[in-house]
Interface confidence: low
C-alpha cells in the first residue's frame, strides 16, 4: 500500500532511506535538457521474492536537444501523483547498505538523471533525516519517520530533529551531528 503523502518536511534537513521496501517506486526523472526515452519505463519498481529484492525496469534519459532545453522535464500526471522527494546531494551515510530481506538498496545513478529523486513509498518504510551542510542538529539521536497505517489511513511518524544554523545571526551554535545516541528528541513542522 502506497503512503498517501510525503514524509514530514524539516527545515534545513534532507531525508533518505537506507533501503527501500518492496513496492517502492522511483520516478525516472531526467535533468534539464534531457527527457525519458519514449519507450522507457516511467518508474523503477522494487520487487523481489523471499530471497532477493531488486529494482525492475531501468531509467533512461536522452537529450531533448530539439526541444526548449530551458524547461524542466515535466513528469507525466501519474508520476506527479504522491511525489516522494529526497535530496540527492548530501547523501547520508546513515548505515552501510546492508541487504535487508524484502528491501532494495539505493538504486545506482543513471546517466543524466535529475538531481532530486522522487519516490513513492509504501507502508512500513523508514526514512532518516540529517541536517544539511551549515546546520547542526539541536538534539542527539537518530531522526527517522515511518509510514504507518492507522484506521485505514497512512501517516508518517514525526521525526525527532531540529536543525539550527551555525552561521545565521541570532542563532546559537548547534552541536555535533547525532551519532545514534538513544535520547534523540523531536522534529519540526517547518514552514512549507
Amino acid at each position: 500500500e502506497l503512503c498517501d503523502d510525503d514524509p514530514p518536511k524539516i527545515t534545513h534537513a534532507t531525508f533518505k532511506a537506507v533501503a527501500y521496501k518492496e513496492g517502492t517506486m522511483l520516478n525516472c526523472e531526467c535533468k534539464r535538457g534531457f527527457r525519458r526515452i519514449k519507450s522507457g519505463s516511467p518508474y523503477m519498481l522494487c520487487t523481489g521474492n523471499s530471497s532477493h529484492s531488486s529494482w525492475d525496469n531501468q531509467c533512461q534519459c536522452t537529450s531533448s536537444a530539439a526541444r526548449n532545453t530551458t524547461k524542466q522535464v515535466t513528469p507525466q500526471p501519474e508520476e506527479q501523483k504522491e511525489r516522494k522527494t529526497t535530496e540527492m546531494q548530501s547523501q547520508m551515510q546513515l548505515a552501510d547498505q546492508v541487504s535487508l530481506p524484502g528491501h532494495c538498496r539505493e538504486p545506482p545513478p543513471w546517466e543524466n538523471e535529475a538531481t532530486e529523486r522522487i519516490y513513492h513509498f509504501v507502508v512500513g518504510q523508514t526514512v532518516y533525516y540529517q541536517c544539511v551542510q551549515g546546520y547542526r542538529a539541536l538534539h542527539r539521536g537518530p531522526a527517522e519517520s515511518v509510514c504507518k497505517m492507522t484506521h485505514g489511513k497512512t501517516r508518517w511518524t514525526q521525526p525527532q530533529l531540529i536543525c539550527t544554523g551555525e552561521t545565521e545571526p541570532s542563532q546559537f551554535p548547534g552541536e555535533e551531528e547525532p551519532q545514534a545516541s538513544p535520547d534523540g528528541l523531536p522534529e519540526s513542522e517547518t514552514s512549507r
Epitope: F172, P182, S191
Partner: antibody
Framework: QVQLVQSGAEVKKPGESLKISCKGS????????IGWVRQMPGKGLEWMGI????????RYSPSFQGQVTISADKSISTAYLQWSSLKASDTAMYYC???????????WGRGTMVTVSS | QSALTQPASVSASPGQSITISCTGT?????????VSWYQQLSGKPPKLILY???KRPSGISDRFSGSKSGNTASLTISGLQADDEADYYC??????????FGGGTQLTVLG
C-alpha cells in the same frame, strides 16, 4: 524515580554572588537538556537558558545572556545557575526543568527561592 | 523575544468547557509543532499537561486537549473540575533555538 532536586532558598544582598544547583536522578542525566526558568513574585514563567550536561553545550535567552551563567558538572549530574553580582530585581523563584523527548519540559524541580534585599 | 500572548484570566463553572489561546509569531508557534502547555497550581512548580500541540503525557486526563492554527495554539479543558483551578502557561520552541513562554492565564472555577 525521575526527579530534579534543587538547592535551598537563598537570601542575599545586592552585589553578592550566588550559585544554585539542580541535581538530576533516576535517568541518564547526561542525555537530556536542563533548562532554567524564572518566575518573579506574582508573575509568569520566563525561559532563561538551557544546558546539555553531557558536553556543557549552552544556550541563553537574549534577555538573560550576560546576566547569568549556566553550567553543569556531569560527574555529579548537576546543573547550575549563577550570578556574579545580584540585583534586587533578581528576586524570584528559579526552576530547573528537564527537556523531555518532545521539546517540552517534562520534569520540574521544586524551585529555589532567591531573595535579594539590602 | 516577546512572550506569547495569553488571556490574563478565564472563568467558568464546573462541568463547562473553556479554551485558552496562545498567540505567537511565525518564528515560534507558527514554525513548529513544539507547543506545550503547563498547569501551575498555587505554590507548586509547573506540570506538563500537553506537548507537540495536542499530545498528553501519561497520567494526564483526556479532558485536556490542544490544537493549533497558524500562529495561535489553544488549550481546551472540558468538564471543568474545581481542582483545575490554576495558572496555565503555553510554551513554544523558536527559530532562534530558544524557548518562550506565554504570559500565563489564571483559570477560576466558579462555584
Amino acid at each position: 524515580q525521575v526527579q530534579l532536586v534543587q538547592s535551598g532558598a537563598e537570601v542575599k544582598k545586592p552585589g553578592e554572588s550566588l550559585k544554585i544547583s539542580c541535581k538530576g536522578s533516576g535517568y541518564s542525566s547526561t542525555s537530556y537538556w536542563i533548562g532554567w526558568v524564572r518566575q518573579m513574585p506574582g508573575k509568569g514563567l520566563e525561559w532563561m537558558g538551557i544546558i546539555y550536561p553531557g558536553d556543557s553545550d549552552t544556550r541563553y535567552s537574549p534577555s538573560f545572556q550576560g546576566q547569568v551563567t549556566i553550567s553543569a558538572d556531569k560527574s555529579i549530574s548537576t546543573a547550575y545557575l549563577q550570578w556574579s553580582s545580584l540585583k534586587a530585581s533578581d528576586t524570584a523563584m528559579y526552576y530547573c526543568a528537564r527537556l523531555g523527548s518532545y521539546y517540552a519540559f517534562d520534569i520540574w524541580g521544586r524551585g529555589t527561592m532567591v531573595t535579594v534585599s539590602s | 523575544q516577546s512572550a506569547l500572548t495569553q488571556p490574563a484570566s478565564v472563568s467558568a463553572s464546573p462541568g463547562q468547557s473553556i479554551t485558552i489561546s496562545c498567540t505567537g509569531t511565525s518564528s515560534d508557534v507558527g514554525a513548529y509543532i513544539y507547543v506545550s502547555w503547563y498547569q501551575q497550581l498555587s505554590g507548586k512548580p509547573p506540570k506538563l499537561i500537553l506537548y507537540d500541540v495536542s499530545k498528553r503525557p501519561s497520567g494526564i486526563s483526556d479532558r485536556f486537549s490542544g490544537s493549533k492554527s497558524g500562529n495561535t495554539a489553544s488549550l481546551t479543558i472540558s468538564g471543568l473540575q474545581a481542582d483545575d483551578e490554576a495558572d496555565y502557561y503555553c510554551s513554544s520552541y523558536t527559530r532562534s533555538s530558544t524557548w518562550v513562554f506565554g504570559g500565563g492565564t489564571q483559570l477560576t472555577v466558579l462555584g
